[in-house]
């Protein structure tokens, strides 16, 4: 039994890091393998992660962490019974994939302005809480070409757009994702989308 593709890990910089790897053949990950991980810090104990299958030869493990700071480093040991298959390390702050924002809501009752709000996925005491920026994707269910991205580069989890920038009388969907420049993170997954019917008063044309 050998490791074909070494484990690669990403952290949500809060409580979970996810590691994936591939074996050289079909493997029952949960019965045959164990991933041991330990924070390099005084008195930290080693923890065991039981991997799940991720395709025939692929395995995935969700490492639980109490908290994360930028200097944290973990040792990783992949075992098959008494055999050490792979030894490595992982620095969560260098491989961050933020959590997806939640509670995306479209408020349509503010004159002819659409107000989109969502929730920051981190608690205020987490370092990323004040460092996330967002991308909001709005698209028409009727017209695949009507697809736009708004970059929200300020901290407030909201976006105002004029309803008139969208077509009236049709349904739109929106979703939002996050990233943090400070850690050069990847983008988060998209939030669940929300749907609304866009309607606004056309301005009265004078002849």
């Amino acid at each position: 039994m050998k490791v074909l593709q070494e484990p690669t890990c990403v952290s949500d910089y809060m409580s979970i890091s996810t590691c994936e790897w591939k074996m050289n053949g079909p493997t029952n990950c949960s019965t045959e393998l164990r991933l041991l991980y330990q924070l390099v810090f005084l008195l930290s104990e080693a923890h065991t992660c039981i991997p799940e299958n991720n395709g025939g030869a692929g395995c995935v493990c969700h490492l639980l962490m109490d908290d994360v700071v930028s200097a944290d480093n973990y040792t990783l040991d992949l075992w098959a019974g008494q055999q050490l298959l792979w030894k490595g390390s992982f620095k969560p702050s260098e491989h961050v994939k933020p959590r997806a924002p939640g509670n995306l809501t479209v408020h349509t009752n503010v004159s002819d302005t659409l107000l989109l709000t969502w929730s920051n996925p981190y608690p205020p005491d987490n370092y990323l809480y004040n460092h996330l920026t967002y991308a909001v994707n709005i698209w028409s269910e009727n017209d695949p070409a009507d697809f736009r991205i708004y970059n929200v580069t300020y901290l407030e989890p909201s976006l105002r757009i004029a309803a008139s920038t969208l077509k009236s009388g049709i349904s739109y969907r929106a979703r939002v994702r996050a990233w943090a420049q400070c850690y050069n993170t990847t983008w988060s997954e998209w939030s669940p989308s929300t749907k609304w019917h866009n309607s606004y008063r056309e301005p009265f044309e004078q002849h």
Partner: antibody, heavy 125, light 106 residues
Framework: QLQLVESGGGLVQPGGSLRLSCAAS????????MTWVRQAPGKGLEWVSA????????NYADSVKGRVTISRDNAKNTLYLQMNSLKPEDTAVYFC??????????????????WGQGTQVTVSS | SYELTQSPSVSVALRQTAKITCGGN??????AQWYQQKPGQAPVLVIY???RRPSGIPERFSGSNSGNTATLTVSGAQAEDEADYYC?????????FGGGTRLTVL
């Protein structure tokens, strides 16, 4: 109030053994990491060993590794330091202390917030 | 292994400001603590997390930490501040103390 009282020190010959104890009171002993720090005559502080709250994890200074064992009995609110193969350079006052691990401003801390008065260990022939 | 360097002694006139430094490679990326020890007594924590004061420690004690130097400042030093002062950090799997600085109040 919080109290840490060391005992078990004394005069021992090189190569001998000694077991230090530290009786804790005034706080929930089983919830805290504990540590030993020593101070040779006229010298500075030197960390010796630490143990986590449940007793499942320990760390040792290189200078004592393999000769010293830290342990605790949470039912008795007592911390121990078993010292073997003692050398003259182990002569010091040994302090038992309560340690805290926490996170502040995106950095991990390990610090000592309470100390006992110490017990003298002298290794001499 | 990680090392912390302190000057052996610092003198300060009564009610003046004393600065005690602790040097270490990139110590600013770590969290520094300071302990006060008077002759024949156990040490006492005076600063933790670079600049936080435990309850009961006078406001004249303050701390800072950046680059390769952590600093303990005693503003308006009193006679009772005469003591040895030790800086401390953690590194990998060890606790590291500086060699100590004797503060003399003149």
């Amino acid at each position: 109030q919080l109290q840490l009282v060391e005992s078990g020190g004394g005069l021992v010959q090189p190569g001998g053994s000694l077991r230090l104890s530290c009786a804790a009171s005034g706080f929930t002993f089983s919830s805290y990491d504990m540590t030993w720090v020593r101070q040779a005559p006229g010298k500075g502080l030197e960390w010796v060993s630490a143990i986590n709250s449940g007793g499942g994890s320990t760390n040792y200074a290189d200078s004592v590794k393999g000769r010293v064992t830290i342990s605790r009995d949470n039912a008795k609110n007592t911390l121990y330091l078993q010292m073997n193969s003692l050398k003259p350079e182990d002569t010091a006052v040994y302090f038992c202390a309560r340690a805290l691990r926490t996170v502040v401003h995106d950095r991990r801390l390990f610090y000592i917030d309470s100390w006992g008065q110490g017990t003298q260990v002298t290794v001499s022939s | 292994s990680y090392e912390l360097t302190q000057s052996p002694s610092v003198s300060v006139a009564l009610r003046q400001t004393a600065k005690i430094t602790c040097g270490g490679n990139n110590i600013g990326s770590k969290s520094a603590q300071w302990y006060q020890q008077k002759p024949g007594q156990a040490p006492v924590l005076v600063i933790y997390a670079d600049s936080r004061r435990p309850s009961g420690i006078p406001e004249r004690f303050s701390g800072s930490n950046s680059g390769n130097t952590a600093t303990l400042t005693v503003s308006g030093a009193q006679a009772e501040d005469e003591a040895d002062y030790y800086c401390q950090v953690w590194d990998t799997s060890a606790v590291v103390f500086g060699g100590g600085t004797r503060l003399t109040v003149l």
